[in-house]
């Protein structure tokens, strides 16, 4: 008997709002998997340590990801 897969994504709401990269403590990108069939992006804010789920399809969020990866590539030797 095949095991029934429980779909368990952590994000139930998503934000399309632009996020200032400087206000980010951490950005987690969780790839799609057998447990959650969509990419999830979880932003942890510097000021209060609160987390927010971002919409991977939003233009503003795509721009944020570009800005963050650009910043990272600058820092790496």
């Amino acid at each position: 008997v095949p095991l029934s897969r429980t779909v368990r994504c952590t994000c139930i709401s998503i934000s399309n709002q632009p996020v200032n990269p400087r206000s980010l403590e951490k950005l987690e990108i969780i790839p799609a998997s057998q447990f959650c069939p969509r990419v999830e992006i979880i932003a942890t804010m510097k000021k209060k340590g609160e987390k927010r789920c971002l919409n991977p399809e939003s233009k503003a969020i795509k721009n944020l990801l570009k800005a963050v990866s650009k910043e990272r590539s600058k820092r790496s030797p």
Epitope: R8, T10, I12, N16, P37, K48, K51, R52
Partner: antibody, heavy 120, light 108 residues
Framework: EVQLVQSGGGVVQPGRSLRLSCAAS????????MHWVRQAPGKGLEWVAV????????YYADSVKGRFTISRDNSKNTLYLQMNSLRAEDTAVYYC?????????????WGRGTLVTVSS | SSELTQDPDVSVALGQTVRITCQGD??????ASWYQQKPGQAPVLVIS???NRPSGIPDRFSGSNSGNTASLTITGAQAEDAADYYC???????????FGAGTKLTVL
Amino acid sequence: EVQLVQSGGGVVQPGRSLRLSCAASGFTFSSYGMHWVRQAPGKGLEWVAVISYDGSNKYYADSVKGRFTISRDNSKNTLYLQMNSLRAEDTAVYYCAKDGGWYDWYFDLWGRGTLVTVSS
Amino acid sequence: SSELTQDPDVSVALGQTVRITCQGDSLTSYYASWYQQKPGQAPVLVISGNDNRPSGIPDRFSGSNSGNTASLTITGAQAEDAADYYCGSRDSSGYQVVFGAGTKLTVL
């Protein structure tokens, strides 16, 4: 105006079914998870179920699992709760509530509530 | 699922400060939220996350979190603050929500 308007409560016999509706307006419904919370007469709040912004994920309290189904129609900005095999202990005021939008689930907008009475 | 523990009854003299607490294992992973409910009315969110007040909630309401305990503080309690207060959070599994049993606040 940002609001949730509920309908569908009433008196129902044990073992029967009932469907609750919650019409949302004034916010981007398709971006937010939506919850049902209930309150038995004279008792505290009890979380019932949540559905993700796109309807792909649904989570339930153990007390209603297998009997209640949460669903949504983003084209109509409406949330539903289908309640089957109702029991006397399901008697309560049922509230729909909008998720706050952050990682820690919470409820920043509530409907006025609708009373469901399960009685023979 | 995990539980949140609240004192059933708390009283405060008019204009004084009162703290309502909420304890539970889930609070080490998730922030608590706080709701005010008056008889015959739907609950109203008063504090969410790390001390966030929705617009329209007076600044005498504040929240704090430490370990497995969350607190709601009302600084200078008013007669209209008399109500039931519930804390809530995602439970330890992360896929359900748990509420405390509620605290009845009396303003003397």
